[in-house]
């Protein structure tokens, strides 16, 4: 034995003295809706060490462990530690109804498992009212010009929007993450960017907008040069 | 001498084995753009144990060491912890020019010192095109109509937007936060919400934007019902 | 492949009105917009107007309103231009045309059908 | 409405002479400017959009430059499948408007 007894056991690199984290994320809004489209729930680790590198998942819906994840191979990082991903296919109705998700990552380099509990956000679900709006007139003296889709009074925050054109999709846009409104409802703007001589000859461009509240999780709206003319 | 030599150094406790944290935020776009108002950098330092609470600040403007900050009384957070703050007054011009401002922080409770530096985004700035829309006709079926003003094509992507009507602030309006386009610029939406009736009456509603790229900082557009029809 | 079919010439009196025809096919017919044009014997082409057969979405040049009505038929992939109160001053080659729109080119009137003649003679 | 002024009417070159014609607006059009070719008794052919980007399969002889109010498109070296009436076309604001026309015949 030595001198000195048993020797100090080493607290972590600093750069590691958390050890693993977890994040847990809801599936694409998109995908809660569709019935053509699956559904998942995602349980990533990051800054697992190379020393313990065995990751693992144990998954709960309500409280009552399920047996249905795929655990992705683990993927190494720049900074020598291993990332991990776990994902767990989800009904559509179960998100959609408040299902609570649960992922519990055990892992030796953790002083105990780390449980990540995510659902959709709770309260009443409100519908979206859709607004297009048509360039100013004095971006009219642009070559591109700013279709606008306003999306307001809707929650959960949730929501998927898309573009297209005579009914071919159209790839050109950006939208803004939901605002919170002063009512609790949440608001955004989808902006679809377009050559002038398309709007001006009259191809008549519709925002898509998918989300729970709607009938049939789907509305459309449309806008036009000749609309309302 | 103790059999066993000196005691082992105890682990942080896991709450915060990382130690403190240090946070460094810019001006708000609004105070370096108006000369009458004080921008200021301002780092903050949270998880500081009650072990060692004394935190020691350091600045540095491109390098060079300043002595004009202000280091607040630190306070006591819900987990035991403290939080601290110092507050640099910076030059509108210095911050405009991209000059780069450091805080070292100091404290017992971490190994070494943490530095954080901070500037204006890199780059060309690129000077915001402001459009207003009116409401949508659908919308004016409601008691409340949106009023739109879009900002885009800005870099960088500090920017203030501000609503008045006929020369008095209105309140009741939610920005979105900036959003990367596919050229590098920016662009957002700002929306005002207003009674139906007061659009209806032809009252005057202005967009008022601030933006390092604009002539004078500022530029302002209109919107009523009577506005170009 | 694209093509535009139109319909064959016409000898109207004056006064009388006449429908002409053109029919689409190698793309979806309800994906672009249909534009028509005139052009008198030796002289240049003017714009009538366009109709969008997604939405029956129409637009004139103010020169041709009341003269032409646009219309067209989903079911068969048709266009239709109907030219009322004819006089003499009518009498030309009528085009459809369509804009071609991939990425970031639009080309505007980019296909062409063969032309309608139109001789309006008592 | 927008006034295309193109001009030459008539012209009468040579084979393999560079040529140029010209089209004026009465007012800044945005590059928003076509050249088509139309041979007798057919129907016009798209060369030119946005002023300087050729059409996909016409020849590269054929070019267009301009901005504001003035256009031009040029064929660098003529050769005689180019005969025939050119016209330009201003679409940066509704109504579309034609320029009158070039007639180009070979000496």
């Known amino acids: 034995e030595s001198k000195y007894g048993p020797p100090c056991p080493s607290c972590p690199a600093p750069e590691f003295l958390g050890g693993p984290s977890v994040f847990l994320f809801p599936p694409k809004p998109k995908d809660t809706l569709m019935i053509s489209r699956t559904p998942e729930v995602t349980c990533v680790v990051v800054d697992v060490s190379q020393e313990d590198p065995e990751v693992q998942f144990n998954w709960y819906v309500d409280g009552v462990e399920v047996h249905n994840a795929k655990t992705k191979p683990r993927e190494e990082q720049f900074n020598s530690t291993y990332r991990v991903v776990s994902v767990l296919t989800v009904l559509h109705q179960d998100w959609l109804n408040g299902k609570e998700y649960k992922c519990k990552v055990s892992n030796k380099g953790l002083p105990s498992s780390i449980e990540k509990t995510i659902s959709k956000a709770k309260g009443q679900p409100r519908e979206p009212q859709v607004y297009t709006l048509p360039p100013s007139q004095e971006e009219m003296t642009k070559n591109q010009v700013s279709l606008t889709c306003l999306v307001k009074g809707f929650y959960p925050s949730d929501i998927a929007v898309e573009w297209e054109s005579n009914g071919q999709p159209e790839n050109n846009y950006k939208t803004t993450p939901p605002v919170l409104d002063s009512d609790g409802s949440f608001f955004l703007y989808s902006r679809l960017t377009v050559d002038k001589s398309r709007w001006q000859e009259g191809n008549v461009f519709s925002c898509s907008v998918m989300h729970e509240a709607l009938h049939n999780h789907y509305t459309q709206k449309s806008l036009s040069l000749s609309l309302g003319k | 001498e103790s059999k066993y030599g000196p005691p082992c150094p105890s682990c942080p406790a896991p709450e915060f084995l990382g130690g403190p944290s240090v946070f460094l935020f810019p001006p708000k776009p609004k105070d370096t753009l108006m000369i009458s108002r004080t921008p200021e950098v301002t780092c903050v330092v949270v998880d500081v144990s009650q072990e060692d609470p004394e935190v020691q600040f350091n600045w540095y403007v491109d390098g060079v060491e300043v002595h004009n900050a202000k280091t607040k009384p630190r306070e006591e957070q819900f987990n035991s912890t403290y939080r601290v703050v110092s507050v640099l007054t910076v030059l509108h011009q210095d911050w405009l020019n991209g000059k780069e401002y450091k805080c070292k922080v100091s404290n017992k409770g971490l190994p070494s010192s943490i530095e954080k530096t901070i500037s204006k985004a890199k780059g060309q700035p690129r000077e915001p095109q402001v459009y207003t829309l009116p409401p949508s006709q659908e919308e004016m079926t409601k008691n409340q109509v949106s009023l739109t003003c879009l900002v885009k094509g800005f870099y960088p992507s500090d920017i203030a937007v501000e609503w008045e009507s006929n020369g008095q602030p209105e309140n009741n309006y939610k920005t979105t936060p900036p959003v990367l386009d596919s050229d590098g610029s920016f662009f957002l939406y700002s929306r005002l919400t207003v009674d139906k009736s007061r659009w209806q009456e032809g009252n005057v509603f202005s967009c008022s934007v601030m933006h390092e790229a604009l002539h004078n900082h500022y530029t302002q557009k209109s919107l009523s019902l009577s506005l170009g029809k | 492949e694209v093509q535009l079919q139109q319909s064959g010439p016409e000898l109207v009196k004056p006064g009388a009105s006449v429908k002409m025809s053109c029919k689409a096919s190698?793309?979806?017919?309800?994906?672009?917009?249909m534009h028509w044009m005139k052009q008198k014997p030796g002289q240049g082409l003017e714009w009538i107007g366009y109709?969008?057969?997604?939405?029956?979405?129409?637009r004139y040049n103010e020169k041709f309103q009341g003269k032409a009505t646009l219309t067209s038929d989903k079911s068969s992939n048709t266009a239709y231009m109907e030219l009322s109160s004819l006089t003499s001053e009518d009498s030309a080659v009528y085009y459809c045309?369509?804009?071609?729109?991939?990425?970031?080119?639009?080309?505007?009137?980019?296909?062409w059908g063969q032309g309608t003649l139109v001789t309006v003679s008592a | 409405d927008i006034k295309m002024t193109q001009s030459p009417s008539s012209i009468y070159p040579s084979l393999g002479e560079r040529v140029t014609i010209t089209c004026k607006a009465s007012?800044?059009?945005?590059?928003?400017l076509s050249w088509f070719q139309q041979k007798p008794g057919k129907s016009p052919k798209t060369l030119i959009y946005?002023?300087?980007r050729l059409v996909d399969g016409v020849p590269s002889r054929f070019s267009g430059s301009g901005s504001g109010q003035d256009y031009s498109l040029t064929i660098s070296s003529l050769e005689y499948e180019d005969m025939g009436i050119y016209h330009c076309?201003?679409?940066?604001?509704?109504?579309?408007?034609f320029g009158g026309g070039t007639t180009l015949e070979i000496k």
């Open positions: 190698g793309y979806t017919f309800t994906s672009s917009v």
């Open positions: 946005r002023a300087n």
């Open positions: 109709i969008n057969p997604y939405n029956d979405g129409t």
């Open positions: 076309l201003q679409y940066d604001e509704l109504p579309y408007t």
């Open positions: 045309t369509r804009s071609f729109y991939y990425g970031n080119s639009h080309v505007l009137f980019a296909y």
């Open positions: 007012q800044d059009i945005n590059s928003y």
